[in-house]
Interface confidence: low
């Protein structure tokens, strides 16, 4: 069965710094979402090989990609306290598959010692499917991620 390997499980970074999240699969997917979990799950990016990536307004200009959709590293730059949260990779296949999640704790530099990651992964890898489509974030953050290009419309 298709799986998404996601790393790291948890990372603590100071405000203004960057974080790398890697999503690896065994291939055979249509594209990949990075989704911020929460009561209103928010799609941060949609990445598909050969297509201009779609990035949520809140992260526009702060996201870099390296690798391919099968082994994608997403770098989020200039992190803000409001970026704290759990990010999960969602591989678009016949059956959507989720990574185990990355908990990103954004701290002030001087208080970094007061924030600590636990050893356990943030979530079990069997995540419930979030609502279909691009969930709306809280109004303070951004508008919903635009749909991916029509050529790669989701089933």
């Amino acid at each position: 069965a298709q799986e998404v390997q996601q790393s790291p499980h948890c990372t603590t970074v100071p405000v203004g710094a960057s974080v790398n999240i890697t999503c690896s699969t065994s291939g055979g997917l249509r594209g990949i979402y990075l989704r911020q979990l929460g009561p209103q799950p928010q799609d941060i990016i949609y990445y598909e090989d050969g297509v201009v990536p779609t990035t949520d307004r809140r992260f526009r200009g702060r996201i870099d990609f390296s690798g391919s959709q099968d082994n994608l590293t997403i770098t989020m730059h200039r992190l803000q306290l409001s970026d704290t949260g759990t990010y999960t990779c969602q591989a678009i296949t016949e059956v959507n598959v989720y990574g185990s999640g990355t908990l990103v704790l954004v701290t002030e530099e001087q208080s970094q010692g007061w924030h600590r990651c636990s050893d356990a992964p943030p979530r079990a890898s069997a995540l419930p499917a979030p609502p279909t489509g691009s969930a709306l974030p809280d109004p303070q953050t951004a508008s919903a991620l635009p749909d991916p290009p029509a050529a790669s419309a989701l089933p």
Epitope: C10, V15, Q36, L37, G38, P39, Q80, L81, S82, D83, T84, G85, T86, L103, L105, V106, T107, E108, S111, W114, H115, R116, C117, S118, A120, P121, P122, R123, D138, P139, Q140
Partner: antibody
Framework: DVQLQESGPGLVKPSQSLSLTCTVT?????????WNWIRQFPGNKLEWLGY???????SYNPSLKSRISITRDTSKNQFFLQLNSVTTEDTATYYC????????????WGQGTSVTVSS | DILLTQSPAILSVSPGERVSFSCRAS??????IHWYQQRTNDSPRLLIK???ESISGIPSRFSGSGSGTDFTLNINSVESEDIADYYC?????????FGPGTKLELK
């Protein structure tokens, strides 16, 4: 609906440790959110103490230096505050509260428990 | 730490009046301010989040505005049940901090 309830001793002696429990009903503390401790001093000043997230990650107010620890018991759906080497300055009403990670508005609060530090 | 100041310390109003509470931050915090109401012998209750976002179950007479360093909570027609202390809280910088509060009382 989520409900939070604090419990613990109402009187603690100086230099001892203060230990409080927040029992959460209506929601699993391992499912989502940050679970916070806040205190309110006589005179009503509010101070955020720290949180434990659904995953067990923690963050503390640096003003409490190394005196504070927030832990949890997932089997009982409880999280705990321990404050060491207390002084009379730690006399306050202690609240537990829930917030969304990265959002930090406290949308559910417990009823509070009063703690007096006195010999 | 970000310091929040609230003014005035006490507001005296008559029922039906419009009232405004002020919260000022020691540095620009965007819209990362939240407002709470605390009645006597009760816990704080979230009224407004992120300066102006309404909260389910909170009467529509409560509204918020502002960005940067200056924020306002308004009650457009005060009712007797609104007599309470009102606090602002910032969430842009660790540690999270609260204002000292404004007490609303009846004339």
């Amino acid at each position: 609906d989520v409900q939070l309830q604090e419990s613990g001793p109402g009187l603690v002696k100086p230099s001892q440790s203060l230990s409080l429990t927040c029992t959460v009903t209506g929601y699993s503390i391992t499912s989502d959110y940050a679970w916070n401790w806040i205190r309110q001093f006589p005179g009503n000043k509010l101070e955020w103490l720290g949180y434990i997230s659904y995953s067990g990650s923690t963050s503390y107010n640096p003003s409490l230096k190394s005196r504070i620890s927030i832990t949890r018991d997932t089997s009982k759906n409880q999280f705990f505050l321990q404050l060491n080497s207390v002084t009379t300055e730690d006399t306050a009403t202690y609240y537990c509260a829930k917030s969304q990670l990265g959002r930090w508005a406290m949308d559910y609060w417990g009823q509070g428990t009063s703690v007096t530090v006195s010999s | 730490d970000i310091l929040l100041t609230q003014s005035p310390a006490i507001l005296s109003v008559s029922p039906g009046e419009r009232v405004s509470f002020s919260c000022r931050a020691s540095q620009s915090i965007g819209t990362s301010i939240h407002w709470y109401q605390q009645r006597t012998n009760d816990s704080p209750r979230l009224l407004i989040k992120y300066a102006s976002e309404s909260i389910s179950g909170i009467p529509s007479r409560f509204s918020g505005s502002g960005s940067g360093t200056d924020f306002t909570l308004n009650i457009n027609s005060v009712e007797s049940e609104d007599i309470a202390d009102y606090y602002c809280q910032q969430s842009i910088s660790w540690p999270l901090t609260f204002g000292p509060g404004t007490k609303l009382e009846l004339k």
